[in-house]
């Protein structure tokens, strides 16, 4: 806290300019009027203030706006944003995407801080849903943003926003998140033709059910092994050898290298060995010929 001292003669600030960088903390406190600061916030970012000085300026704004800053001030905070606490930000009502962009720009190149997370949360809640423009902006600054949301939060993403998602945005998503995103992606891309559709839907397939994988196997998509390995195990298990062969196309040879890893390992255990042998890859571990497979889960469901 800066002591309350009188402003020295001739040092009262008439405008926010570069001369203020030479003011000591107590002089900034005594000589800069908070209302002047608020009206000239757009100048602050261009002036090489230290963070110590920015603390003083923040204190002045806090006194002027104890209930939270107006958006006209927030939009021009610049580096002063880094001095805000999540508690400060929770008092704000940020509605403009331009304001959001301006503040994210300050933190660009750095990991998401608690301040940024709070800002985004306030902004998205204020909008009611994660619209395409917002998602575009957030994933541009933070590619992992989408995967930081809970399945419940992801449910508010409209299908139209899925067009903004790039494959790398989904890199850290877990199956629960992809379960929510996949149906939205399927809806968003439903009017595309086969090959274009597959290119777009590929990143979301970790949430695809068996019936959709079966349908894809009929479309000559040539899924790569990396995508196949991210599929839900429960969705892969019911696929036949013929369906997997069609799904992977020339990439089917990669199964051999992955035969000890899920979902390939579990899928092999469900296939007849003579069916696996038709692939000519030397996959082992299938059901020996002549054995009868009873699906007890199906039997229980029927009784």
């Amino acid at each position: 806290e800066v002591e309350k001292t009188a402003c020295p003669s001739g040092k009262k600030a008439r405008e926010i300019d570069e001369s203020l960088i030479f003011y000591k903390k107590w002089e900034l406190e005594a000589c800069v009027d908070a209302a002047l600061l608020a009206t000239q916030m757009d100048r602050v970012n261009a002036i090489p203030f230290t963070y110590e000085q920015l603390d003083v300026l923040k204190h002045k704004l806090d006194e002027l706006y104890p209930q939270g800053y107006p958006e006209s001030v927030i939009q021009h905070l610049g580096y002063l944003f880094l001095k805000m606490s999540p508690e400060d930000i929770r008092k704000w009502n940020v509605t403009s995407l331009e304001t959001l962009k301006a503040l994210l720009e300050v933190n660009k190149g750095h990991e998401m801080s608690p301040q940024v997370a709070t800002l985004i949360d306030r902004f998205v809640k204020g909008r009611g849903q994660l619209d395409k423009d917002t998602l575009d902006t957030l994933t541009a600054f933070y590619p992992g943003y989408l995967c930081s949301l809970s399945p419940e939060e992801l449910s508010s993403v409209p299908p139209s926003s899925i067009w903004a998602v790039r494959p790398q945005d989904l890199d850290t998503c877990d199956p629960r998140q992809l379960d929510v995103l996949y149906p939205k992606a399927r809806l968003a891309f439903q009017n595309m033709n086969g090959s274009e559709y597959f290119v777009k839907i590929q990143s979301f397939l970790g949430g695809a059910p068996t019936e959709d994988l079966k349908a894809l196997s009929q479309q000559n998509v040539s899924m790569d092994l990396a995508t196949f390995m991210k599929l839900r195990t429960d969705a892969v298990l019911p696929l036949t050898v013929a369906e997997v062969q069609k799904l992977l196309g020339p990439h089917v040879e990669g199964l051999k290298a992955e035969e000890r890893h899920r979902p390939v390992r579990d899928w092999i255990l469900r296939q007849r060995q003579d069916d696996l042998d038709t692939l000519g890859l030397g996959l082992q571990g299938g059901i020996p010929n002549g054995y009868l497979v009873l699906d007890l889960s199906m039997q229980e469901a029927l009784s």
């Epitope: 090489p48 203030f49 230290t50 963070y51 580096y79 001095k83 190149g109 750095h110």
Partner: nanobody
């Protein structure tokens, strides 16, 4: 984290010249601007000069025309060329960097102007 190490201080006669250096290391990509701050015995610290990442310079009135701040990005070094030194320039000179999200300081180098 940014580390700053000053050098170049010493005893100099009035009217003489000195060049201070400040070697920066660590996360230097996060630096927004750097400056020289001095503290004379029994006085408050005061900003002498600042230089931004794009090379814009600012000087305190008491050193204008005598001191020049510069930086060599290839060597990650900040300089302060001090000419026409006076007795009142005697102080510990600190290098300071404002970098995301705080201010970093060197340990200081003593400049004594005396005959």
């Amino acid at each position: 984290e940014v580390q700053l190490v000053e050098s170049g201080g010493g005893l100099i006669q009035p009217g003489g010249s000195l060049r201070l250096s400040c070697a920066a290391s660590g996360n230097i990509g996060s630096i927004r601007h750097m400056g020289w701050v001095r503290q004379a015995p029994g006085k408050e610290r005061e900003l002498v000069a600042t230089i931004t990442t794009v090379g814009t310079t600012y000087y305190a009135n008491f050193v204008k025309g005598r001191f020049t701040i510069s930086r060599d990005n290839s060597k990650n070094t900040l300089y302060l060329q001090m000419n026409s030194l006076r007795a009142e320039d005697t102080a510990v000179y600190y290098c300071r960097a404002t970098a995301h999200p705080t201010d970093y300081w060197g340990q200081g180098t003593l400049v004594t102007v005396s005959s």
